[in-house]
Each structure stands twice: as C-alpha cells, then as structure tokens.
C-alpha cells in the first residue's frame, strides 16, 4: 500500500436545501484506470461511511441506489455533492481515494471538509 496526497477544502456551508458540494483532488502517481472514492464522516469521535463509488477513468461515478451522494470526475478531480443534509449532519467529511488498478495499490485520505448545515427557519404564517 503506497501513500497518495488528497486535497479537499477545509470548510463548506450547505445550502438552505441541505446540499453541499466540494472537490476532492488526488495526486495520481501513475495511470490508474480504476479508482474508488469513499466519503467518511467524523463526528463525536465516530467515523462512519457516507457513500462510496468505484469508477473507471473517463467514466461517471456511480453511487448505489438511495445514496445521498452524487458526483462527477474530471482527470484527478472528483466533484462530490451530498444531498438531504440536516443540522444534525454537521461534521467533518473526509475524502478517501484508492487507486485500485493497475497495481500498485495507492491510498490517499484527505484532511476532511467541515460541512456546516443550518436547518432553514420555518416560513412564518402568511395571509397571502
């Protein structure tokens, strides 16, 4: 297992609709054809898996059905979008990238993106 550098923004604020997007960029040492991207969430000393996708270079990322993640890839960059977030989902979201094929296997883990989620205020009663 060889180490690889992964960069991601330090802070992102989710939209009022609970959507957060950020770029995960990895310094590929070789010509990987198969890449696996996993998003982890660290909160309250627990690390949980948010979503994961394996893709072939040049192809779209495919997440599982009912995943809260979507994404696109461009070269060594992965554009990740997480939907349906609520205030309780605030936390550090870590991008983990694995170069699966061809060998050698490379692993890179970013420092994490702190995603802040603020639940929208309920609309006041209106006469209109």
């Amino acid at each position: 297992c060889k180490a690889m550098h992964v960069a991601q923004p330090a802070v992102v604020l989710a939209s009022s609709r609970g959507i957060a997007s950020f770029v995960c960029e990895y310094a590929s040492p070789g010509k990987a054809t198969e890449v696996r991207v996993t998003v982890l969430r660290q909160a309250d000393s627990q690390v949980t898996e948010v979503c994961a996708a394996t893709y072939m270079m040049g192809n779209e990322l495919t997440f599982l059905d009912d995943s809260i993640c979507t994404g696109t890839s461009s070269g060594n960059q992965v554009n990740l979008t997480i939907q349906g977030l609520r205030a309780m989902d605030t936390g550090l979201y870590i991008c983990k990238v694995e170069l699966m094929y061809p060998p050698p296997y490379y692993l890179g883990i970013g420092n994490g993106t702190q995603i802040y989620v603020i639940d929208p205020e309920p609309c006041p009663d209106s006469d209109f």
Epitope: T38, D44, V47, E49, A52, D66, S67, G84, M88
Partner: antibody
Framework: QVQLKESGPGLVAPSQSLSITCTVS????????VYWVRQPPGKGLEWLGV???????NYNSALMSRLSISKDNSKSQVFLKMSSLQTDDTAMYYC?????????????????WGQGTSVIVSS | QNVLTQSPAIMPASPGEKVTMTCSAT?????MSWYQQKSGSSPRLLIY???NLASGVPVRFSGSGSGTSYSLTISRMEAEDAATYYC?????????FGAGTKLELK
C-alpha cells in the same frame, strides 16, 4: 434468495479469541452493509459493529478495543474477530444485512438475519 | 449513546385486541426499526424507516412516531403475534436497541 449463515467455534476458553464467519448469498457485499448483533441468554440485542459496502468499519465503542470486522467480497464472507473473551461474552451472535452506508435517503433496516451461532465462554 | 426505553416490559393481550407498545429515546431520532423475535428464532424485521411495513409482514402491524417518541401497533392481536418486540434507532452510532416488550397471549 437472500441468506446469511454464521459459523463459529461454539466453545471458547476465557481470555481466548473468537472468530466467526458470516457467509452470504443472494446479494453482493459491495451493495449492502453487514451488521453484527449479539444476544446473551435471556437478554436483549446488542449491536457490535458494521462493515459497510465500501469496506469501512464502525464499532460499538464499548467493545471497540476487542473487535475487528473484515470481509472478502469475492468469497461473499464477512469475518468477526473478538479478543479477550470473558464469561459475559456468552451469547448468540448474529450477522444481518443492512444499509450500505450510514447516511441514506431511505432503507434503514436490518432486513435479513442469519440463524445465529451460539458462543459459550467457559473453561 | 441514545438509550431506548420500551414500555411496557411485559404485555398480556387477547386475540382480536388492539395492542400498542412504545419506544422512547433519550435524544431525537430520524429513523426507527422494529423487530419481532420468537423464542429460539432470529429477529425478524417488521417496520423500517419508522412506518414502512417490511416485505411479508401482515398489514395489522404499523409503526409511527417522531422525535423521541415512537410506537408499534397491532390492530388485532393474533396468537402467532406472541413474541418479544425490539425497537432500534439509526440516528447515531453506536446503534442501540430497546430492552424489548414481551407480548403474551392472555
């Protein structure tokens, strides 16, 4: 159809380690998480840990130092290892299929369970 | 951790009777599951995502609730429903189960 089957040693001596294998069929380990739950005789259910579709693990913090979960996707097998067993670890150990990740749009359930494997810790 | 308290612990009920058991959490929950376990058997999923009926489960079972208060209802008790019922939360790790409600045939 979906099936999970646990296989374990049955009897374990105190301070020894436990290894249980969960062999699954009817679904892929890359599309679902596998959750481990135990039940001491006459008592309730206790969640031990999970290995998610992506291969990341999460453990019950009370047991984290003694637990290890891994899997072999190609063999459709999930492995639970637990160290330093004591008599209060005597229980029925279950594996169950569940959500692939911790945060989903829907589908929060352990929908299929194995028949369980009985583990008795005794000298 | 999020502690789930089920009540009552033991509940006698007659065939045809409406049965409601509750599950109370120490902090707010988004999704709750309910499981049925009969003596000597593995748990069986009844309700997922708080109110959705699992495949093959009779429509007499229903789940509801929000925040910290959830319930499982059996509209008309049948003899085969005698079992222990567990609630389980998905909102925080570690995942936790309630201690169970034992439903007995009166």
């Amino acid at each position: 159809q979906v099936q999970l089957k646990e296989s374990g040693p049955g009897l374990v001596a105190p301070s020894q380690s436990l290894s249980i294998t969960c062999t699954v069929s009817g679904f892929s380990l890359t599309s679902y998480g596998v959750y481990w739950v135990r039940q001491p005789p006459g008592k309730g259910l206790e969640w031990l840990g999970v290995i998610w579709a992506g291969g990341t693990t999460n453990y019950n913090s009370a047991l984290m130092s003694r637990l290890s979960i891994s899997k072999d996707n190609s063999k459709s097998q999930v492995f639970l290892k637990m160290s330093s067993l004591q008599t209060d670890d005597t229980a029925m150990y279950y594996c169950a299929r569940g959500p692939p990740h911790a945060m989903m749009k829907r589908g929060y359930a352990m929908d299929y369970w194995g028949q369980g494997t009985s583990v008795i810790v005794s000298s | 951790q999020n502690v789930l308290t089920q009540s009552p612990a033991i509940m006698p009920a007659s065939p045809g009777e409406k049965v409601t058991m509750t599950c109370s959490a120490t902090s707010s929950i988004t999704y709750m599951s309910w499981y049925q376990q009969k003596s000597g058997s593995s748990p069986r999923l009844l309700i997922y995502d708080t109110s959705n009926l699992a495949s093959g489960v009779p429509v007499r079972f229903s789940g509801s609730g929000s925040g910290t208060s959830y319930s499982l209802t059996i509209s008309r008790m049948e003899a085969e429903d005698a079992a222990t019922y567990y609630c389980q939360q998905w909102s925080s790790y570690p995942l936790t189960f309630g201690a169970g409600t034992k439903l007995e045939l009166k």
